[in-house]
Amino acid sequence: LIIGFGISGRHSITVTTLTSAGNIGEDGILSCTFEPDIKLSDIVIQWLKEGVMGLVHEFKEGKDDLSDQDEMFRGRTAVFADQVIGGNASLRLKNVQLTDAGTYKCYIITSKGKGNANLEYKTGAFSIPEVNVDYNASSENLRCEAPRWFPQPTVVWASQADQGANFSEVFNTSFELNSENVTMKVVSVLYNVTINNTYSCMIENDIAKATGDIKVTDSEIKRRSHLQLLNSKAS
């Protein structure tokens, strides 16, 4: 969490951003809130990115003004216009690119004063793994697949019966580049598993951590998955 305060002759207002991560090729949100104002026409929101000449987005007098928007953000940004009056300056970003990573500034002017806060935006790819029994194999194996990751993650397996101990010798992981030549498909096979045990496939890079669990019994297969973004901190 980053909290910024305005300076200058005018009073300062508190602006709060949240460090977040964007999933390449998907739509993202850059979070920013500020002390609300009762008059929409008095509110100016400017989003800027370090190293970029033009603006990322500007909202003033109750509507967007994209006259000075940088070409790299053309047709890709929007604020939640109906929530601005309540202090929400968060930015919607379409089709997140690797190059969108960087330091952004959320700059606010209201009748109460000015304020700004920086936001670190990380970009990468992350997806929930699916764990299945690999029936094609001669032994009882588990196959963990996740379609999109970047940068290349680490993969570890753990077993409940072994008190969460990691298996290093008995699994094999491969990374296959996807068609857009950035993200990769992750496939990991765990060999010689035993029945009535819960196994976890854990995939992690510096942006996200995902887990796929599977429990195989004589009568059923139970699955569970979880994805957690790392380093979401407020400013």
Partner: antibody, heavy 120, light 107 residues
Framework: QLQLQESGPGLVKPSETLSLTCTVS??????????WGWIRQPPGKGLEWIGN???????YYNPSLRSRVTISVDTSKNQFSLKLSSVTAADTAVYYC????????????WGQGTLVTVSS | EIVMTQSPATLSVSPGERATLSCRAS??????LAWYQQKPGQAPRLLIY???TRATGIPARFSGSGSGTEFTLTISSLQSEDFAVYYC?????????FGGGTKVEIK
Amino acid sequence: QLQLQESGPGLVKPSETLSLTCTVSGGSIKSGSYYWGWIRQPPGKGLEWIGNIYYSGSTYYNPSLRSRVTISVDTSKNQFSLKLSSVTAADTAVYYCAREGSYPNQFDPWGQGTLVTVSS
Amino acid sequence: EIVMTQSPATLSVSPGERATLSCRASQSVSSNLAWYQQKPGQAPRLLIYGASTRATGIPARFSGSGSGTEFTLTISSLQSEDFAVYYCQQYHSFPFTFGGGTKVEIK
């Protein structure tokens, strides 16, 4: 409500320049949350996005047509225009102008369209 | 560019029946997809944007679903005025592209 109306010659000779104008009424072309776009549709075929312009004059064109297309805006007349150079018979189409959301980028509303035939 | 493929090319349906139109993108477009209706001699009309949000004034019998690469437009009970050509359009990345259209005709 907002309305768009295309105007321009219905017949253009091969190798010449096609010129169309779209007049916006019932609203300002300076409305901040919108681009203004051109789309075309050859007879009996599908739709092709040509490009768009913001009221400040910044443009974006379809790469397949970029070398031949110019879109301009005249805010004083509440109009924007399309020029397509070096036309051939393949450019024969109904040309539509439309308001394009800045994001989401849907087209709404559309002009009624004008048929431009390229023939000598 | 992203290629949009619609199926079927023609759909024959009786009035009152349900119509299901498909649109597939050559790569993920998230939810950045719109649907349009076009009648002969008329301009297209926006029905759906954001894959599932109905445009202003569009009847509830029109609904959109899907995300990523697979999308569906459903007309729950076809009225006589619904017989037309329907186009999907992706606005995920430039250049924006349209599908080839699905003609919904009276059976």
